[in-house]
């Protein structure tokens, strides 16, 4: 039901289910070396891992999706691991008039869930 | 860059990329037949399809994810198709004291993007 409880224990084994993971990336990796000046190395937290039935369900829709995927796996995809919240990131970058510091609110994941 | 433009034309062919699709589901399918009284048949809009590079990117994070997936496909998953917004749905359901109408805000997808 819509009252079903999302579960937090991973039935697939440690590190297999949806979680936050840090990925190192350079500005060159991101294609940003022409406009971002600092930081030159980014610690990018991303959401990775599988979403088994009802694991960290984002909401009622995700619970429905998990249920219908079990019934119609060819038609309804399993929920997938995406950010539930973000960490602000300060970038020093070029502007038309010089250099600017700007905070980006949607760049690095802080938490993950299955949607 | 964070200025990259998410694209809206599907390079994989019609209907293959992330989009909204209606799935018919009965209360039995959802395991809700013991508490939901109406509607007895639900038109569930869900997000399905693939997320090729920069297609309908949800935000800067999704653009980064797409880029890093191209560089490290084993380590960074591709963005996936999830709801960007929801349509409220009214359900008539049993309560301890009788029957109630309740609006659910997170049950049916209204739009999709790649996150």
């Amino acid at each position: 039901s819509a009252h079903a409880h999302p579960r937090d224990s991973c039935p697939l084994g440690p590190g297999r289910c949806c979680h936050l993971e840090t990925v190192q990336a350079t500005l060159e990796d991101l294609g940003w070396s022409d406009w971002v000046l600092s930081p030159r190395q980014l610690q990018l937290s991303m959401c990775v891992g599988e979403c088994p039935h009802l694991y960290r369900s984002a909401n009622t829709h995700a619970q429905i999706k998990a249920r219908l995927h079990g019934l119609q796996p060819d038609k309804v995809p399993a929920p997938c691991c995406v950010p539930s919240s973000y960490t602000p990131v300060v970038l020093m970058h070029r502007t038309d008039s010089g250099v600017s510091l700007q905070t980006y609110d949607d760049l690095v994941a802080r938490g993950c869930h299955c949607a | 860059s964070a200025h990259a433009h998410p694209r809206d034309s599907c390079p994989l062919g019609p209907g293959r990329c992330c989009h909204l699709e209606t799935v018919q589901a009965t209360l039995e399918d959802l395991g809700w037949s013991d508490w939901v009284l109406s509607p007895r048949q639900l038109q569930l809009s869900m997000c399905v399809g693939e997320c090729p590079h920069l297609y309908r990117s949800a935000n800067t994070h999704a653009q980064i994810k797409a880029r890093l997936h191209g560089l490290q496909p084993d380590k960074v998953p591709a963005p996936c198709c999830v709801p960007s917004s929801y349509t409220p749905v009214v359900l008539m359901h049993r309560t301890d004291s009788g029957v109630s109408l309740q609006t659910y805000d997170d049950l049916v997808a209204r739009g999709c993007h790649c996150a």
């Epitope: 840090t22 070396s33 022409d34 000046l37 600092s38 930081p39 030159r40 190395q41 980014l42 610690q43 937290s45 960490t87 602000p88 990131v89 300060v90 970038l91 020093m92 250099v99 510091l101 905070t103 760049l107 690095v108 802080r110 | -």
Partner: antibody
Framework: QVQLQESGPGLVKPSQTLSLTCTVS??????????WTWIRQHPGKGLEWIGA???????YYNPSLKSRVTISVDTSKNQFSLKLSSVTAADTAVYYC???????????WGQGTLVTVSS | DIVMTQSPLSLPVTPGEPASISCRSS???????????LDWYLQKPGQSPQLLIY???NRASGVPDRFSGSGSGTDFTLKISRVEAEDVGVYYC?????????FGGGTKVEIK
């Protein structure tokens, strides 16, 4: 307006561990791109970068001190800390905490705290 | 480590007159992106250092426009167009191209 405040003992005995904490107010310590940094200044001398920590917990240390330094962060308290082990009189200095964009652009500093190493 | 050398060690100045401080690095601070990774700081007597200039020539927020940074590669200059009494203190350059960041020895600016 971001403010930083160092705290910790002003006197440490030789061979012991120097421990300092920097409390950040007026902003979250959990921001990407920001490196929370320790810098020291020996009496009447210039500045020396000790090391820094990113929001993710990644640390960067001056190779000249690396074997003795540990920097950690406590996001729940909006604090970061410095531990310097096996201190000698040469570690007597004013210790500053600062906010950097990566390891440059130190735009906010604590007022500094003098730590004397003496028996 | 990159070695930073400042000159002069001490600079007596007259209010209203210009002043210039030199900073030299043991290797080029010019990044492939075209920017020089060099900061300038001022430490006023009894205070913490404050950021004046970053990336060689960009004034930090709130810094008066009488301060300017120039130079490229290994040779850099901080100029004060018209010195004011409040500008006294020790000026430091710092390279930020490589870890560890390293500071120059400082230039003490005092009123004549």
């Amino acid at each position: 307006q971001v403010q930083l405040q160092e705290s910790g003992p002003g006197l440490v005995k030789p061979s012991q561990t120097l421990s300092l904490t920097c409390t950040v107010s007026g902003g979250s310590i959990s921001s990407g791109g920001i490196y929370w940094t320790w810098i020291r200044q020996h009496p009447g001398k210039g500045l020396e970068w000790i090391g820094a920590i990113a929001y993710s917990g990644s640390t960067y240390y001056n190779p000249s001190l690396k074997s003795r330094v540990t920097i950690s962060v406590d996001t729940s308290k909006n604090q970061f800390s410095l531990k310097l082990s096996s201190v000698t009189a040469a570690d007597t200095a004013v210790y500053y905490c600062a906010r950097g964009i990566e390891y440059q652009h130190f735009d906010y500093w604590g007022q500094g705290t003098l730590v004397t190493v003496s028996s | 480590d990159i070695v930073m050398t400042q000159s002069p060690l001490s600079l007596p100045v007259t209010p209203g007159e210009p002043a210039s401080i030199s900073c030299r690095s043991s290797q080029s601070l010019l990044h492939s992106n075209g920017y020089n990774y060099l900061d300038w700081y001022l430490q006023k007597p009894g205070q913490s250092p404050q950021l004046l200039i970053y990336l060689g020539s960009n004034r930090a927020s709130g810094v008066p426009d009488r301060f300017s940074g120039s130079g490229s590669g290994t040779d850099f200059t901080l100029k004060i167009s018209r010195v004011e009494a409040e500008d006294v203190g020790v000026y430091y350059c710092m390279q930020t191209l490589e870890l560890p960041p390293t500071f120059g020895g400082g230039t003490k600016v005092e009123i004549k």
